[in-house]
Interface confidence: medium
């Protein structure tokens, strides 16, 4: 007959980008299943991902209710096919996650350059304001809506013919930079939350260069 021994989950890890938040853990289950619970510091436990054989659980729906709260999750282990069975202490084995505060810790997703427009010796570069899964009044908020002025973007730009990079910063989603007339430039942007201690920067956006489709050019 099959064993009823279960092992507690371990290596509980939060994976979160732009508030899309998944709890991952080990081990891959052998003759056991998992259920996850999540709570704020002062709230009740809510169960998710009931009796799953996965080793991850999407908790986005819970954390987006208030991204500034601090959350704790726990993963319960049950014998497969006998979820009423308990550990030796009279309750299912479980392991706690580290605390997680989405606003402070979610990774910033790779930004995208939405467009650039040249007018004479000025180029306006616009960063796409990415939608998050955070809602307010039944509307999904953008990254800028959520972070406000805590979020800045850094623009890296350089002449196509050279490797010397210049930078500009904005706490909106637009840059207006000076360029040399007749020169083609390439652009990349990075999202930054300067006052964070962890996960301060996103990866760089894909590079976009003048002379490609994204841009518009108007000579004056």
């Amino acid at each position: 007959s099959g064993t009823t021994n279960t092992v507690a989950a371990y290596n509980l890890t939060w994976k979160s980008t732009n508030f899309k938040t998944i709890l991952e853990w080990e081990p891959k289950p052998v003759n056991q299943v998992y259920t996850v619970q999540i709570s704020t510091k002062s709230g009740d436990w809510k169960s998710k991902c009931f009796y799953t054989t996965d080793t991850e659980c999407d908790l986005t729906d819970e954390i987006v209710k208030d991204v500034k709260q601090t959350y704790l999750a726990r993963v319960f282990s049950y014998p497969a096919g006998n979820v009423e069975s308990t550990g030796s202490a009279g309750e299912p084995l479980y392991e706690n996650s580290p605390e997680f505060t989405p606003y402070l810790e979610t990774n910033l997703g790779q930004p995208t350059i939405q467009s650039f427009e040249q007018v004479g010796t000025k180029v306006n570069v616009t960063v796409e304001d990415e939608r998050t899964l955070v809602r307010r009044n039944n509307t999904f908020l953008s990254l800028r809506d959520v972070f406000g002025k805590d979020l800045i973007y850094t623009l890296y730009y350089w002449k196509s013919s050279s490797s010397g990079k210049k930078t500009a910063k904005t706490n909106t989603n637009e840059f207006l930079i000076d360029v040399d007339k007749g020169e083609n430039y390439c652009f990349s942007v990075q999202a930054v939350i300067p006052s964070r201690t962890v996960n301060r920067k996103s990866t760089d956006s894909p590079v976009e260069c003048m002379g490609q489709e994204k841009g518009e050019f108007r000579e004056i």
Epitope: K68, Y103, K149, K169, T170, N171, I193
Partner: antibody, heavy 118, light 107 residues
Framework: EVQLVQSGAEVKKPGASVKVSCKAS????????MNWVRQAPGQGLEWMGE????????TYNQKFKARVTLTVDQSTNTAYMELSSLRSEDTAVYYC???????????WGQGTTVTVSS | DIVMTQSPDSLAVSLGERATINCKAS??????IAWYQQKPGQPPKLLIY???NRYTGVPDRFSGSGSGTDFTLTISSLQAEDVAVYYC?????????FGGGTKVEIK
Amino acid sequence: EVQLVQSGAEVKKPGASVKVSCKASGYSFTGYYMNWVRQAPGQGLEWMGEINPSTGGSTYNQKFKARVTLTVDQSTNTAYMELSSLRSEDTAVYYCARRELGGPFGYWGQGTTVTVSS
Amino acid sequence: DIVMTQSPDSLAVSLGERATINCKASQSVSNGIAWYQQKPGQPPKLLIYFASNRYTGVPDRFSGSGSGTDFTLTISSLQAEDVAVYYCQQDYSSPWTFGGGTKVEIK
């Protein structure tokens, strides 16, 4: 160690201007908003405005918008608050404060007493 | 502007006893609330942010709770060094606004 060191006490006449400085050290000056908060004698705290040292962009409390100017000097990691057209009710301690991620003020200067008296 | 109303204005508590300070916002501020302690002649000191998170180095006798419009700062066991004025502040919507303060004294 993060430190915000403010300039010394000032005595001004009504109608004059005062400029208070706040020198930051121990952290990346351009990475945090600098705020200004004042406290009249025996009274509570009143937010005046904030400046982004990276861009120089400012946001003001409407109450002070016509009279206050916030500036920074990145070369010396110093923020400035200038208040014009002073009146007696501007007598207060003026604090600079670093705004942490999400909004709270985690570090404060020691305060600068401004006295407006004829 | 969001108005923050603190109560009581002053509070006298015996050493080792619990002190509770309330703060009410004129509209919902989610959990965008910070609490500060100010002693005479000193600048305010941040105690709690995001309504319930203790700031670095703050003793665990200080705790915050609440969400929406009603918030509480609790000192679980009052110490002599806790005598001060305590302020709540909303950092949900600019202009950032403070409560009027609560003076905590030893009974």
